[in-house]
């Protein structure tokens, strides 16, 4: 699987999850998030050669098409597969609130 | 929606579904498919600027990050959203068989 366990341990050029740290205030302008100050959102990147973690029949077909037609511009793209939530602390005035934000952290990628 | 109705009628540079005809024999080397000879598989391509048909909170966050950090290499990618099946006719010996192949035709795209 093209997950953090594999991708963070290997120098993988093809589609894989890459580490990306986002600082809420500096990178997003979100002053309202109190904790954490930032988090590893990660992202997916890298070429999608034929059959690499293909998501659907279409991405398999497109990968094969691309292999047999190297000049073609149509190819699958490396995108998130599994995402996890992030728990944050913010304040409503002086009152602390805890919220779970869904689909914030990429754990693995696929060719789609 | 970034679907065929919209994308095929507009000269859209950003993420959109594009027409792609695949000939089973010539483009894939699939001699076993009798009918159709080919089909419009289509594909997704084009930049994913901030907030364009974002798929998840992560892709929205990544788009926002990319907007505020233009030098960043991390950005969402244009991939299939809705896919449709394709019905094909093939032969097992002299016996015709009809099969529905799932997820063969891209109908719309998203930024993921």
């Amino acid at each position: 699987a093209l997950d953090t366990n594999y991708c963070f341990r290997n120098l993988e050029e093809n589609c894989c999850v890459r580490p990306l740290y986002i600082d809420f205030r500096q990178d997003l302008g979100w002053k309202w998030v109190h904790e954490p100050k930032g988090y590893y959102a990660n992202f997916c990147s890298g070429p999608c050669p034929y059959l690499r973690s293909a998501d659907t029949t279409h991405s398999t077909v497109l990968g094969l098409y691309n292999t047999l037609n190297p000049e073609a511009s149509a190819s699958p793209c490396c995108v998130p597969q599994d995402l996890e939530p992030l728990t944050i602390l913010y304040y409503v005035g002086r009152t602390p609130k805890v919220e779970q934000l869904s689909n914030m952290v990429v754990k693995s990628c696929k060719c789609s | 929606a970034l679907d065929t109705n919209y994308c095929f009628r507009n000269l859209e540079e950003n993420c959109c579904v594009r027409p792609l005809y695949i000939d089973f024999r010539q483009d894939l080397g699939w001699k076993w498919v009798h009918e159709p000879k080919g089909y419009y598989a289509n594909f997704c391509s084009g930049p994913c600027p901030y907030l364009r048909s974002a798929d998840t909170t992560h892709s929205t966050v990544l788009g926002l990050y990319n907007t505020l950090n233009p030098e960043a290499s991390a950005s969402p990618c244009c991939v299939p959203q809705d896919l449709e099946p394709l019905t094909i006719l093939y032969y097992v010996g002299r016996t015709p068989k009809v099969e529905q192949l799932s997820n063969m035709v891209v109908k719309s795209c998203k930024c993921s």
């Epitope: 997003l28 302008g29 309202w32 913010y90 409503v92 919220e99 934000l101 | -």
Partner: antibody, heavy 120, light 108 residues
Framework: QVQLVQSGAEVKKPGSSVKVSCKAS????????ISWVRQAPGKGLQWVGG????????NYAQRFKGRVTLTADTSTNTVYMELSNLRTEDTAVYYC?????????????WGQGTLVTVSS | ETVLTQSPGTLSLSPGERATLSCRAS???????LAWYQQKPGQAPRLLIY???SRAPGVPARFSGSGSGTDFTLTISSLEPEDFAVYYC?????????FGQGTKLEIK
Amino acid sequence: QVQLVQSGAEVKKPGSSVKVSCKASGYTFSSNVISWVRQAPGKGLQWVGGVIPIVDIANYAQRFKGRVTLTADTSTNTVYMELSNLRTEDTAVYYCARTLGLVLDAMDYWGQGTLVTVSS
Amino acid sequence: ETVLTQSPGTLSLSPGERATLSCRASQSLGSSYLAWYQQKPGQAPRLLIYGASSRAPGVPARFSGSGSGTDFTLTISSLEPEDFAVYYCQQYADSPITFGQGTKLEIK
């Protein structure tokens, strides 16, 4: 420059609903919280609630809970306020306003206001 | 909820004079959860002061805010003709946000 442009005036019957829009431009929409404040004719200001774009976290004044829904459409940089089960005392000018950054905060830019009239 | 009481209800002064507007909270707001706004007829409120004493961008230096706890003051050092309006204080320490009933500053 920062602008908040609201939808036009509405006349509604008691018991019905109204949805007011507020389109933001001139700044990074998803970086700021949007609050809604109303002002009855000749009266003071009353906070309705606020919403955080992207994550759609909304906070409401207790008196409006269950009747008001605040949502943000990040694809169009637009925030919506829907108020249901309208009463005549809901007749007011409704303003959207950008906060300085926190969920509860001072508000530095305001929309032009939308007059909602509730009358039978 | 936190009740804000503004005084006086109406203040009659002449251009060039000093205006002092008061805002009292029913419970302590600390030192940084109070804002002041100016509103003219038919217009949206305009932010003047936030954090009790910080001037918003573009606000003239004649406007100043002070105070902490339960007592806050907006001072206009020398009134200009365009300053005659209604002034509201707002607290954002606790939900719900609340506003004072307003002080009308009118020309004497």
